[in-house]
Amino acid sequence: LNTTILTPNGNEDTTADFFLTTMPTDSLSVSTLPLPEVQCFVFNVEYMNCTWNSSSEPQPTNLTLHYWYKNSDNDKVQKCSHYLFSEEITSGCQLQKKEIHLYQTFVVQLQDPREPRRQATQMLKLQNLVIEQKLISEEDLGGEQKLISEEDLHHHHHH
């Protein structure tokens, strides 16, 4: 899922909905649909993006994210302060360096504010989710500097 801080329309496509989805708002539902899975990656230990497939919800839903660190001094529940958006709805959260503690168990909770009992919690080991990036020189890029991940290095002329 491409997430941006801006809110583009996105292109029409036939991409599948990869994760399960939301509690119906106007039906008699036997069971609550699971929330999408949250995937987190730490970039150069500078910032971390935790994202989810927002389009797997049956209707546009601004899911909210909370996080904390298990069994540590940082166990206070924190609200996401910097959401990422896709098609005008939340699809991720960006955490800054000071909020990242690599060697503590990171707990992330996604919730549907319209249906508070519909929430999912995941525990992640952040040290396993670090992506090292290299700074490409201006000459290589033909102008501007950008951070590019290792696996994208051989494609950097497309950026």
Epitope: N9, E12, D13, A16, D17, L20, L33, P58, E87
Partner: antibody, heavy 119, light 108 residues
Framework: QVQLVQSGAEVKKPGASVKVSCKAS????????MHWVRQAPGQGLEWMGW????????NYAKRFQGRVTMTRDTSITTAYMELIRLRSDDTAVYYC????????????WGRGTLVTVSS | EIVLTQSPGTLSLSPGERATLSCRAS???????LAWYQQKPGQAPRLLIY???SRATGIPDRFSGSGSGTDFTLTISRLEPEDFAVYYC?????????FGQGTKVEIK
């Protein structure tokens, strides 16, 4: 190719039920929500509900709750819409429509199934 | 439920002319969540525009969508013979999904 093929026309008596099928091909059936929309003769489009084939979860429009059931058989990539206690005003063309994977509009429609309810 | 009202009910025009179709919502609809469909007699609807202004795959550029909030417009810059049909707007931002009652574009 990517398509939705619906079952043939049906004629039913008031009080009876009908089950319309929608066979999906050319894409991952379990990956897209399937919606049902109906259209009475000479009228507009009316949304009935959806089913998520991956899990079987459903959501029905209020006016059809208690009368409609949406199911699927993933082994044959087919979605079904059953409407019970049929009335004459249920006479309509019933469409299945696939929801886009990236947003919430309908990017693929079946050709429709005409259900006529008449005594 | 969001009610969509389309106008006019019928538009009588000649090939080559410009068609302007209106869709008004009873409450604000995010422009990301408004679509237009075309339907010809005996056929299923076909997606033309999504996100208020993005053309679906294979749709000619004579079709364009615009608008935001409660007022949306579908414009056909130069009508071709195959464009005479019924056009529906739809909001998909909140359940239940709703459609306008349709605008018929007929040959004058």
């Amino acid at each position: 190719q990517v398509q939705l093929v619906q079952s043939g026309a049906e004629v039913k008596k008031p009080g009876a039920s009908v089950k319309v099928s929608c066979k999906a091909s050319g894409y991952t059936f379990t990956g897209h929500y399937m919606h049902w929309v109906r259209q009475a003769p000479g009228q507009g489009l009316e949304w009935m509900g959806w089913i998520y084939p991956h899990s079987g979860h459903t959501n029905y429009a209020k006016r059809f709750q208690g009368r409609v059931t949406m199911t699927r058989d993933t082994s044959i990539t087919t979605a079904y819409m059953e409407l019970i206690r049929l009335r004459s005003d249920d006479t309509a063309v019933y469409y299945c429509a696939r929801r886009s994977g990236r947003s919430w509009y309908f990017d693929l429609w079946g050709r429709g199934t005409l259900v006529t309810v008449s005594s | 439920e969001i009610v969509l009202t389309q106008s006019p009910g019928t538009l009588s025009l000649s090939p080559g002319e410009r068609a302007t179709l209106s869709c008004r919502a009873s409450q604000s609809v995010s422009s990301s969540y408004l679509a237009w469909y075309q339907q010809k007699p005996g056929q299923a609807p076909r997606l033309l525009i999504y996100g208020a202004s993005s053309r679906a795959t294979g749709i000619p550029d004579r079709f364009s969508g615009s608008g935001s909030g409660t007022d949306f417009t579908l414009t056909i810059s130069r009508l071709e013979p195959e464009d005479f049909a019924v056009y529906y707007c739809q909001q998909y931002g909140s359940s239940p999904w709703t459609f306008g009652q349709g605008t018929k574009v007929e040959i004058k």
